[in-house]
């Protein structure tokens, strides 16, 4: 509603008018007029005859539109009739037996224009219509219709026929008093008081009463000829003067305040009439005779030069008895009534809804159900008036106003605001929490993905990308075949699974050879020179290699490098049937755990079993037999990174690489080369 700029009192006026004439929730009545019911055979829906006859009453259920009408709650209202007749009968417009026809189904919301209607006919052998008093199969018929229905005065006639019965009826929707418009949502109460003077048009718009104008018809049309500048009016055909002016059309000036017997040509002059003198033309010896100062029938007594005394009649006071003793001073009018003094006392003008000498009686009582939205009504003054006690979320003298704490949209990140009695709460979307859903929750914070799976935050949860050999929602299922499960290695040999091919490799103990370590290295009857020569040669080679390693070690010790940054030893010329247990790999850089990078081929990444890295072994060449009693003991595990995988597809190097995310702080990566004759374990520092 547009509101013109006005003074403070004007704003208050507009507010009151706005509360009075506004777009409201809506209010109207669905009216159902039963006309004729035919049940010629006098039978129930089950087919059983009624005894003695079908004494028929109706239950009506009005609800929201449903494509298929279900028997659920009657959301728009429900009403029952008394017994209206037996078997077949016509229903009079104003039915006897206390029932009203048409039946009234009031609603207090905007009429949606569509509806569903269920009408049931029931048989009541006696006068008790409670369900428990009826026969077990008391239903005679039930009909259900649905459709569109506009607000209007015209009745829609309908007839519904079932197997054994026929019902003729008509219905319509009309707005309640003071509600207008296509869906009874425009509230307009005609009025003729200080806050407006209008009646309501059919669409709910205002129509000003004669003599009034303005948006809310509270601006009177003044007396014709009333001076434009010097006059104004508070009611039609009136001319009230602005300060300094008087007369019927406010075109006469007012003399100076207190000017008793003088005149003016402009406001506030005081030119004395003949026989009077002084600044206010109020001085005269024969004051009472010339001036008659005493008002309201008071007796005047001269009391010396330029003075007088007034003896007042009962009910008046003041020097000139000009002040009326007002009986309204005690505020006798209640409930907002306004008090008017009269000759013989006072009179209370009561606001709408009240009457009585002091406006003490309310025209409404609890019997009128004046409390909306589930408010409970309390009688006051022996039922003369009432007070509404409102449930949470509603206020107003009749609980007509809803308290909504969600209008400021306090919930962030798409959270849904819910009114909960005296408070509100936010229902957060997945991934958010906090009082106002302002906190983002990372589902990956708990590291839910097993075996090195990569976690991705999604809007409705998380997703794990699993390394090769694992599957499941959290990478918890191992999919690779454990080739060592069948214990294929003989003679206490150690079995390793080659994860790239799901085959096994046997690490033989001393004295055994073969792919399964099944052949003992025995001494035959003839001396095996070749084998001995080979063994001695290998021993010499090992000694030489050891010396070279010691020399290299000594050279490195002389260098000023920090030992904690020492690179891992290079490895070369591995024996075909030998593998390096993970516990024998030594990382001399104790700041970092061993990480392995497999270059472009990322498909091998994943967890299988934790081979560990022993920081306690002294730095030196890697080879068979080191720390024989400790395998697979370790102090630091590689499980948090990616484990070493041991391969057998290239005999020259059975350590292959896997993928591990690089350390963001040190960028330390271990590379295991698979060139033909050399495995290189390097640490980038």
């Amino acid at each position: 509603m547009a509101a013109a700029s006005r003074s403070a009192s004007g704003w208050a006026l507009l507010l009151l008018v706005a509360l009075w004439q506004q777009r409201a929730a809506g209010s109207g009545v669905f009216q159902l007029q039963l006309q004729e019911f035919i049940n010629e055979r006098g039978v129930l829906a089950s087919g059983r005859p009624c005894e003695p006859g079908c004494r028929t009453f109706f239950r009506v259920c009005l609800k929201h539109f449903q494509a298929v009408v279900s028997p659920g709650p009657c959301t728009f209202g429900t009403v029952s009739t008394p017994v209206l007749g037996t078997n077949s009968f016509a229903v009079r417009d104003d039915s006897s037996g206390g029932g009203r026809n048409p039946l009234q189904l009031p609603f207090n919301f905007t009429w949606p224009g569509t509806f569903s209607l269920i009408i049931e006919a029931w048989h009541a052998p006696g006068d008790d219509l409670r369900p428990e008093a009826l026969p077990p199969d008391a239903l005679i018929s039930k009909i259900a219709i649905q459709g569109s229905l506009a607000v209007g005065q015209n009745w829609l006639l309908d007839e519904q026929t079932s197997t054994l019965t026929r019902l003729r009826y008509s219905y319509r929707v009309i707005c309640s008093d003071n509600y207008y418009g296509d869906n009874c949502s425009r509230l307009c109460k005609k009025r003729n008081d200080h806050f407006g003077h209008y009646v309501c048009q059919p669409d709910g718009n205002l129509s000003c009463l004669p003599g009034w104008t303005g948006e809310y018809c509270q601006q009177p049309i003044c007396l014709s000829g009333c001076h434009e500048q010097n006059g104004y009016c508070s009611k039609p055909a009136e001319c009230l003067c602005r300060p300094g002016w008087q007369g019927r059309l406010c075109n006469e000036c007012i003399p100076h305040n207190g000017c008793r017997h003088g005149t003016c040509s402009t406001p506030w002059q005081c030119t004395c009439d003949e026989g009077w003198g002084g600044l206010f033309c109020d001085q005269d010896l024969n004051y009472c005779t010339h001036h008659s100062p005493c008002k309201n029938g008071a007796t005047c007594s001269n009391s010396g030069q330029r003075s007088y005394t007034c003896t007042c009649r009962p009910g008046y006071t003041g020097v000139d008895c000009e002040l009326e003793l007002s009986e309204c001073d005690s505020n006798p009018c209640r409930n907002g009534g306004s008090c008017k003094d009269q000759e013989d006392g006072y009179h209370c003008l009561c606001p709408p809804g009240y009457y009585g000498l002091h406006c003490e009686h309310s025209t409404l009582s609890c019997a009128d159900s004046p409390c909306f939205n589930g408010g409970s009504c309390r009688e006051r003054n022996q039922g003369a008036n009432y007070a509404c006690e409102c449930p949470p979320n509603f206020t107003g003298s009749n609980c007509e106003k809803k308290v909504d704490r969600c209008t400021s949209n306090p919930c962030a990140n798409g959270g849904q605001c819910l009114n909960r009695g005296p408070s509100r709460m936010c229902r957060c979307r997945p991934g958010f929490t906090g009082t106002y859903c302002e906190l983002h929750v990372s589902d990956c914070a708990r590291n839910p993905c097993a075996h090195g799976g990569t976690c991705h935050d999604l809007e409705n949860g998380l997703m794990c990308t699993c390394p090769a050999g694992f599957s499941g929602r959290r990478c918890e299922v191992r999919t690779s075949i454990d080739a060592c499960a069948s214990s294929p290695c003989f003679n206490r040999a150690t079995c390793y699974t080659d994860l790239s091919t799901d085959t096994f490799v046997c690490n033989c103990p001393y004295g055994f050879v073969g792919s399964r370590c099944e052949f003992p290295v025995g001494l035959p009857p003839s001396f095996p020179w070749v084998a001995v020569s080979l063994g001695v040669g290998l021993a010499v080679l090992l000694v030489l290699l050891g010396m070279v390693a010691v020399a290299v070690r000594q050279l490195r010790l002389r260098r000023p490098d920090d030992g904690s940054r020492e690179a891992m030893n290079n490895l070369s010329d591995f024996q075909k049937d030998n593998l390096i247990p993970a516990a024998q790999l030594k990382n001399t850089n104790q700041k970092k755990e061993l990480e392995v990078d497999c270059g472009l081929d990322k498909s091998n990444c994943g967890k299988q079993q934790n081979h560990t890295l022993d920081y306690n072994l002294a730095p030196g060449p890697l080879g068979r037999g080191t720390m024989p009693g400790k395998f697979p003991h370790s102090d630091k595990s590689l499980g948090e990174k990616a484990p070493l995988r041991l391969h057998s597809e290239k005999p020259e190097c059975r350590i292959s690489a896997i993928c591990s995310p690089r350390d963001s702080m040190y960028q330390s990566v271990c590379l295991i080369s698979e060139e033909r004759n050399e495995c290189v374990i390097a640490t980038e520092v």
């Epitope: 428990e132 077990p136 008391a138 039930k142």
Partner: antibody, heavy 119, light 106 residues
Framework: EVQLVESGGGVVQPGGSLRLSCAAS????????MSWVRQAPGKGLEWVAD????????YYADSVKGRFTISRDNSKNTLYLQLNSLRAEDTAVYYC????????????WGQGTMVTVSS | SYELTQPPSVSVSPGQTASITCSAD??????VSWYQQKPGQSPVLVIY???KRPSGIPERFSGSNSGNTATLTISGTQTMDEADYLC?????????FGGGTKLTVL
């Protein structure tokens, strides 16, 4: 507490008779229609008879018409079923049930009493 | 005679919705009640007048009836709901029961 307790069941020979009783408590017995419903072993429910609150109206299933009689004594809050000319197919658990009026169905049931008709 | 036809059995997983039907000619013009019966126990009324729930019956039980079919729906089925379910209506002076449907909660 609303309760229905049946009694009077037992083993009887074909052609014999029995009288079942149903004691009601916890509700105003004289205001409600009452029924008997039976259930043969391993079978579904079968309505037997019902009676109006004042005892004026009585209805029977075709399978028992002429052989069974429903009655009530509102002063004793008790419902009865007289079973005559019993047959093997009458073997069942017999339930006493309170009929909720106005097509509500049977809202209170007893625990049942077993009637076995066997030679 | 008037017969109410039910499927002998219906299976459902816990937490899922189970629907049990009851069919007869013009059944929608009559009112239907539904009963739950567990082995060795008396029947219990769970739905009356097509869709109304007696006090004490959980909200997951609901009913509907139109045309020739009435339906009992159990949403969020629990293992405790495993039982026989029987529909019931009226025909002439008779009370008519369906044959019953065994609901199995897998």
């Amino acid at each position: 507490e609303v309760q229905l307790v049946e009694s009077g069941g037992g083993v009887v020979q074909p052609g014999g008779s029995l009288r079942l009783s149903c004691a009601a408590s916890g509700f105003t017995f004289g205001n409600h229609w009452m029924s008997w419903v039976r259930q043969a072993p391993g079978k579904g429910l079968e309505w037997v008879a019902d009676i109006s609150s004042d005892g004026r109206y009585k209805y029977y299933a075709d399978s028992v018409k002429g052989r069974f009689t429903i009655s009530r004594d509102n002063s004793k809050n008790t419902l009865y079923l007289q079973l005559n000319s019993l047959r093997a197919e009458d073997t069942a658990v017999y339930y006493c049930a309170k009929a909720g009026g106005g097509n509500v169905g049977f809202d209170i049931w007893g625990q049942g009493t077993m009637v076995t008709v066997s030679s | 005679s008037y017969e109410l036809t039910q499927p002998p059995s219906v299976s459902v997983s816990p937490g899922q919705t189970a629907s049990i039907t009851c069919s007869a000619d013009k059944l929608g013009t009559k009112y239907v009640s539904w009963y739950q019966q567990k082995p060795g126990q008396s029947p219990v009324l769970v739905i009356y007048q097509d869709a109304k729930r007696p006090s004490g019956i959980p909200e997951r039980f609901s009913g509907s009836n139109s045309g020739n079919t009435a339906t009992l729906t159990i949403s969020g089925t629990q293992t405790m709901d495993e039982a026989d379910y029987l529909c019931q209506s009226w025909d002439r002076s008779d009370v008519v029961f369906g044959g019953g449907t065994k609901l199995t909660v897998l």
